[in-house]
Interface confidence: low
């Protein structure tokens, strides 16, 4: 299937002025009910999914003002193993808490240059950026 | 912090021609080792993360050629509860398999119109699009 090229403005439309950071209200792209506090190797009976998971994780902010989205959040596992559903605290070494990765499409703001090499505003350069989405309780691989 | 506006080309640079779907080779944005087959309510000891999870899931393709990324994958839980780490098969109703949602930044290709209303190529319209990333084994909420 087809892919898009980068998108670069010209002098014409939209103006370079428009490409400056605007203050268009866009909902923040942080995970719902994000809480950087009270995180430990335990599964809560309340709160957001990342704290109730038996493979609990916290979020780490990755901000780059020259990237779209500017804010990305990386999951960081709080436990090497899975937590007991019974107590919500002690671990079972038979289950591993593993990061789930995803190659997310992001765009970087790069200076554009016209045919004569002069600055022509900003281009959006498409990239794949690896983010960790969550921690998942898995059965360890059995090597055959 | 600041946000970007939509990015629309003009007649100038890049040309409308360039904005048609190009065949720039970009790695597909599907999850690693994606497997739509052999999926059931069990936790494997081998294979990708989504099949080894005790909250296993499959991926469902969501393709829109007027959206960037064109291909998104939605997780679909295979079990209502978590699977036993011991056997990898039977479920424990004390753990719920819940979808983890994320509002992903996507761009839709929309026709742009100049000041006089004439067609000026395509704009990229930024949107938040809800995708389910994975299924997570969680302790059920305790209602206080």
């Amino acid at each position: 299937y087809s892919h898009w090229p980068s998108c670069c403005p010209s002098k014409g439309y939209p103006s370079e002025e428009l490409l400056r950071w605007s203050t268009v209200p866009v909902p923040p792209l942080k995970p719902a009910s994000l809480d950087f506090h009270s995180v430990s190797c335990r599964a809560s009976e309340d709160g957001p999914l990342n704290s109730r998971a038996i493979s609990p994780w916290r979020y780490e902010l990755d901000r780059d003002l020259n990237r779209l989205p500017q804010d990305l959040y990386h999951a960081r596992c709080l436990c090497p193993h899975c937590v007991s559903l019974q107590t919500g605290s002690h671990m079972d070494p038979r289950g591993n808490s593993e990061l789930l990765y995803h190659n997310q499409t992001v765009f970087y703001r790069r200076p554009c240059h016209g045919k004569k090499g002069n600055h022509k505003g900003y281009c959006l350069e498409r990239r794949l950026y690896r983010v960790s989405l969550a921690c998942v309780c898995v059965r360890p691989r059995v090597m055959g | 912090y600041s946000h970007w506006p939509s990015c629309c080309p003009s007649k100038g640079y890049p040309s409308e021609e360039l904005l048609r779907w190009s065949t720039v080779p970009v790695p597909p944005l599907k999850p690693a080792s994606l497997d739509f087959h052999s999926v059931s309510c069990r936790a494997s000891e081998d294979g990708p993360l989504n099949s080894r999870a005790i909250s296993p899931w499959r991926y469902e393709l969501d393709r829109d050629l007027n959206r960037l990324p064109q291909d998104l994958y939605h997780a679909r839980c295979l079990c209502p509860h978590c699977v036993s780490l011991q056997t990898g098969s039977h479920m424990d109703p004390r753990g719920n398999s819940e979808l983890l949602y994320h509002n992903q930044t996507v761009f839709y290709r929309r026709p742009c119109h100049g000041k006089k209303g004439n067609h000026k190529g395509y704009c990229l319209e930024r949107r938040l699009y809800r995708v389910s990333l994975a299924c997570v084994c969680v302790r059920p909420r305790v209602m206080g």
């Epitope: 899975c82 002690h90 | 780490l85 424990d92």
Partner: antibody, heavy 121, light 113 residues
Framework: QVQLQESGPGLVKPSETLSLTCTVS????????WTWIRQPPGKGLEWIGN???????NYNPSLKSRVTISVDTSKSQVSLKLNSVTAADTAVYYC???????????????WGQGTTVTVSS | DIVMTQFPDSLAVSLGERATINCKSS????????????LAWYQQKPGQPPKLLIY???TREFGVPARFSGSGSGTDFTLTISSLQAEDVAVYYC?????????FGPGTKVDIK
């Protein structure tokens, strides 16, 4: 495959302390709940108590003043001490583990073969 | 303490026939928030330790033959052996693990008629 083996003196004098050890092999002693159950000759099963998280304990109120359950992770052993025994404490004593970490600590899926303790002078 | 009662005390069933054992708890062992009954069934053969058959009142333990099934909710529970086999001769116990002390029923002895 995890195995549990109870051990201890087969004969204990009245008023003395009964001390039993459950040795765990083929599996981790961490992350599980460990339970002691006893069965007097020709009778049913009686739950003595359990321990989880290496330190959290529950005891049967009928025995609470006399019983102590502990875990020694370095030796992979679970211990039972029962003070001031009488003839009524004569029984087969079993050590058991939760079936699996994510199941309720009351349902016991792995049992030792049991050890017979007779209280007599 | 929750008192568990079982009936009958003993029963004799022909090979291949159905055996039904009842268990009653003195108080509710169902937690409505997760819709789970905190009740297990065990089988004990002479000279052996008990073996877990059923937990959550109706979930069969891994490796337990399908002829064993559990049912019931709240305070009344049943263990059914759909087609009795010679190796099923044993004493069967129910146990609540809703609250400590976890208590067992007195047992039901199953023999072949």
């Amino acid at each position: 495959q995890v195995q549990l083996q109870e051990s201890g003196p087969g004969l204990v004098k009245p008023s003395e302390t009964l001390s039993l050890t459950c040795t765990v092999s083929g599996g981790s002693i961490n992350s599980y709940s460990w339970t002691w159950i006893r069965q007097p000759p020709g009778k049913g099963l009686e739950w003595i108590g359990n321990i989880y998280n290496s330190e959290n304990t529950n005891y049967n109120p009928s025995l609470k003043s006399r019983v102590t359950i502990s875990v020694d992770t370095s030796k992979s052993q679970v211990s039972l001490k029962l003070n001031s025994v009488t003839a009524a404490d004569t029984a087969v004593y079993y050590c058991a583990r939760t079936y699996n970490w994510n199941y309720e600590i009351g349902a016991m899926g792995v049992w030792g073969q049991g050890t017979t303790v007779t209280v007599s002078s | 303490d929750i008192v568990m009662t079982q009936f009958p005390d003993s029963l004799a069933v022909s090979l291949g026939e159905r055996a039904t054992i009842n268990c009653k708890s003195s108080q509710n062992v169902l937690i409505t928030s997760n819709n789970k009954n905190y009740l297990a069934w065990y089988q004990q053969k002479p000279g052996q330790p008990p073996k877990l058959l059923i937990y959550w009142a109706s979930t069969r333990e891994f490796g337990v033959p399908a002829r064993f099934s559990g049912s019931g909710s709240g305070t009344d529970f049943t263990l059914t052996i759909s087609s009795l086999q010679a190796e099923d001769v044993a004493v069967y116990y129910c146990q609540q693990y809703y609250s400590t002390p976890f208590t067992f029923g007195p047992g039901t002895k199953v023999d072949i008629k």
